[in-house]
Amino acid sequence: TPEVWVQVRMEATELSSFTIRCGFLGSGSISLVTVSWGGPNGAGGTTLAVLHPERGIRQWAPARQARWETQSSISLILEGSGASSPCANTTFCCKFASFPEGSWEACGSLPPSSDPGLSAPPTPAPILRAD
């Protein structure tokens, strides 16, 4: 069964700067990745970035840099200033559209006891089957 993992990290150098890493554990070919915050995309969440492996990347503030790390994982750096900056309990979600598995989404947030610059190891978050 495919799984999605989400890792959220607060940068030690900029306490309001976050790095989100997401990965897809499955055998299918990924056709689109959507990163959102405030909840799952389409369920109250706000899209931060969309990554298409053959067309490119689209991001919206406060996203600073979205990128593919591997064929099945992505990372997103968020700016840490302004009214739209994230806070420690913000939920981030990643949705992977894959063929033939369909769409899989998982969410995560900064571990409550995390020190800046540290994060929990990437583990599969609760999986939501989108379709």
């Epitope: 298409h52 492996p53 053959e54 067309r55 490119g56 990347i57 689209r58 840099q65 593919w68 064929q71």
Partner: nanobody, 118 residues
Framework: EVQLVESGGGLVQPGGSLRLSCAAS????????MGWYRQAPGKDRELVAT???????KYVDSVKGRFTISRDNAKNSLYLQMNSLRAEDTAVYYC????????????WGQGTMVTVSS
């Protein structure tokens, strides 16, 4: 499919300048890496310069200080300002785009000829 169309090539004297442009058909997504490559007659295609959508730039040593790569993300357009041109810069210059930065799918333009000769 992303289409890339180059323009700006031509004949120029040694020491002269040219500005190449590359327009991409993709208008919604930013192409992660865009770059210029060139192929001189009888030689292999070689990298000239690349730029990511966040502005990270790389140049081949032979053009450093003479060529400047830039891009307009809003238009997904790529540029190459070529100054102090030399005869050895004569080549067909190709625009390249790697939307993911992983090489999963790479697109090429048709090329534009740059001839440096007196």
């Amino acid at each position: 499919e992303v289409q890339l169309v180059e323009s700006g090539g031509g004949l120029v004297q040694p020491g002269g300048s040219l500005r190449l442009s590359c327009a991409a058909s993709e208008t919604y997504f930013d192409l992660y890496v865009m770059g210029w490559y060139r192929q001189a007659p009888g030689k292999d295609r070689e990298l000239v310069a690349t730029i990511t959508y966040t502005g990270s730039i790389k140049y081949v040593d032979s053009v450093k200080g003479r060529f400047t790569i830039s891009r307009d993300n809003a238009k997904n357009s790529l540029y190459l300002q070529m100054n102090s041109l030399r005869a050895e810069d004569t080549a067909v210059y190709y625009c390249n785009a790697d939307p993911s930065g992983l090489g999963r799918k790479v697109y090429w333009g048709q090329g534009t000829m740059v001839t440096v000769s007196s």
